[in-house]
Interface confidence: low
């Protein structure tokens, strides 16, 4: 039977600088079980090197010198006794680019270099970007673990160093930003800001980075009510708004949050399960009536909580004057005057430019005034 030396390995392999690659490989060689059983040694060499003198890139022979530049990075994986010659290459370097050949040695009879099946390794520039992974969604005020990892990287070669940058990291001790993981307690203002993880191999020039935009969930912190684009002043969760009766009113309620809160308007001070009069942040009243002086509430409902603000409407009426009208009665001349406005006005009689105060007597003059609102009556 003809001696059979066969090697199955791919012709070419491409790997990005700094990453790892596994090159599957199997081989066969002529062996008879009645032979003695010296150890089986296998070797990977750089092409063009002479097996007897050259340093190997990987071997299972403890007595052979391994090239310092491939030590720990090029490793035989798998069981050579089962004819597995798979080669693991870690922390690939540009200078690793080139051809490699496999050699088998066993006793005196088996010494063979598989020169016809060379492995061509090409190391290209690193374009792979790291992954930034959020183990849980970002929520304002809740510590969350982030990790930065590079697909295709492995622990061969010098360690990876990490650096994190971003506005959300400002209060952190710089040491905590040099690990592959980061515990972040985001704030509402961190939403939409950038976070960058940069990875670098110690002692190498290879760096790669990824930037993500933070998506921070946060409940509304404040509610603002706008009238004609102008924010109303708010004191202790209440806003005061003077408005003329009969006037059209359009109010906009805004409560910044992420995801956006559901905004609704209610009449008065509602119970939690009350029915809204508007299911948007906009409240439109075609004509304000004096009956609406009870006010309205804007509520911002969010998965992380709710906030509401009461709008106290002060409805003013334009003055309507009835009178004065005078008639002679038994006790003398009786003059009446009525005035409609809100709040109810105070009425004053003048006699030759001298004021007669309400509910008073002055000589032969007697004044009676009442203000049940919105009418003020005086006689």
């Amino acid at each position: 039977e003809k001696p059979v030396y066969e090697l199955q390995v791919q012709k070419s392999v491409t790997v990005q600088e700094g990453l790892c690659v596994l090159v599957p490989c199997s081989f066969s060689y002529p062996w008879r079980s009645w032979y003695s059983s010296p150890p089986l040694y296998v070797y990977w060499f750089r092409d063009g090197e002479i097996p007897y003198y050259a340093e190997v890139v990987a071997t299972n022979n403890p007595d052979r010198r391994v090239k310092p530049e491939t030590q720990g990075r090029f490793r035989l994986l798998g069981d050579v006794q089962k004819k597995n010659c798979s080669l693991s290459i870690g922390d690939a370097r540009m200078e690793d680019t080139g051809s490699y050949f496999f050699r088998v040695e066993r006793g005196r009879d088996v010494k063979y270099s598989y020169q016809q099946n060379k492995l061509n390794l090409e190391v290209t520039a690193l374009i792979e970007k790291p992954d930034i992974h959020f183990l849980e969604p970002l929520e304002s005020g809740r510590p969350t673990r982030l990790s930065c990892s590079l697909p295709g990287s492995c622990e061969a070669g010098p360690p990876l160093t990490f650096s994190w940058t971003g506005n959300a990291l400002s209060p952190l001790d710089p040491e905590t930003t040099r690990s592959s993981e980061l515990t972040l307690t985001p704030r509402p203002e961190d939403h939409g800001t950038n976070l960058t993880c940069q990875m670098k191999r110690q002692g190498a020039q290879v760096t790669t980075e990824r930037t993500v935009q933070l998506n921070v969930s946060y409940a509304p912190q404040t509610i603002t009510i706008f009238r004609n684009g102008i924010a109303l002043e708010i004191l202790q969760n209440t806003s005061y708004l003077p408005v003329l009766e009969g006037q059209a009113l359009r109010l906009l309620c805004d409560a910044p949050s992420n995801p956006p809160a559901h905004l609704s308007w209610f009449q008065g001070s509602p119970a939690l399960n009350a029915t809204p009069i508007s299911n948007t942040g906009i409240l439109e009243l075609r004509r304000v009536r004096s009956a609406e002086k009870g006010g309205f509430t804007c509520r911002a409902q969010h998965p992380l909580g709710f906030l509401q603000i009461f709008l106290n409407l002060s409805v003013y009426s334009l003055p309507q004057l009835l009178g004065p009208s005078c008639s002679w009665e038994a006790e003398g001349l009786h003059c009446r005057c009525s005035f409609r406005a809100w709040p109810a006005p105070s009425l004053c009689w003048r006699l030759e430019e001298k004021p007669l105060e309400g509910n008073s007597s002055q000589g032969s003059f007697k004044v009676n005034s009442s203000s049940p609102g919105p009418w003020a009556n005086s006689s």
Epitope: H133, L135, R145, P151, S153, E155, S180, T183
Partner: antibody, heavy 120, light 107 residues
């Protein structure tokens, strides 16, 4: 050699407490997140709890939340699991496992396991 | 919580057979999926992480594939030492969850 060695398992009555320890060696302990994973007799694997390398973040399965506490002492290269209010269903082999840096919470190194038996 | 469903729960195969185990997630786990091998009385051993990356020292006959919610572990030529239970695990979100396991037995 990278190694994890659990201890502290044993027999405990329902309602009782135990503290498991996991001693790590052969690697930079503080760089890796760690976890406890358990396996009830004849059953599959169940993740119990995880902790980040700096110990700033901790995570728990709903089944143990409020009863178990994970912690670590990076100066001693040791991971702990304090188990209170133990129940019969907590009976299992408890493994400590190391987080693979290339993928969060994939576990590349496991301890040999320690048996916790909760029985009256 | 993300549920991981493995199938089959057990299978019988011979040395040299090609074996395929599937794992389905109840929602996308992106590429945060790992496979483990466990032999009786022993701790689990990581085979594959990030769906298809072979862990250092694991024979190349093991391979992983899939994306999103459907994943596969393939043993191209079953060896005697491969008879064991295999578990998938997602690490996309907490709680981390494992599949129920697939026991590979000798036919």
């Amino acid at each position: 050699e990278v190694q994890l060695l659990e201890s502290g398992g044993g027999l405990v009555q329902p309602g009782g407490s135990l503290r498991l320890s996991c001693a790590a060696s052969g690697f930079t302990f503080s760089n890796h997140a760690m976890a406890w994973v358990r396996q009830a007799p004849g059953k599959g694997l169940e993740w119990v709890s995880g902790i980040s390398g700096s110990a700033a973040s901790t995570y728990y399965a709903d089944s143990v939340k409020g009863r178990f506490t994970i912690s670590r002492d990076n100066s001693k290269n040791t991971l702990y699991l304090q188990m209170n209010s133990l129940r019969a269903e907590d009976t299992a082999v408890y493994y400590c496992a190391r987080d693979l840096l290339a993928l969060p919470y994939a576990f590349d190194i496991w301890g040999q396991g320690t048996l916790v038996t909760v029985s009256s | 919580d993300i549920q991981m469903t493995q199938s089959p729960s057990s299978l019988s195969a011979s040395v040299g057979d090609r074996v395929t185990i599937t794992c389905r997630a109840s929602q996308s786990t992106s590429s945060y999926l790992s496979w483990y091998q466990q032999k009786p009385g022993k701790a689990p051993k990581l085979l594959i992480y990030a769906v298809s990356t072979l862990q250092s020292g694991v024979p190349s006959r093991f391979s992983g594939s899939g994306s999103g919610t459907d994943f596969t572990l393939t043993i191209s030529s079953l060896q005697p030492e491969d008879f064991a239970t295999y578990y998938c695990q997602q690490s996309y979100s907490v709680p981390l969850t494992f599949g129920g396991g697939t026991k590979v037995e000798i036919k």
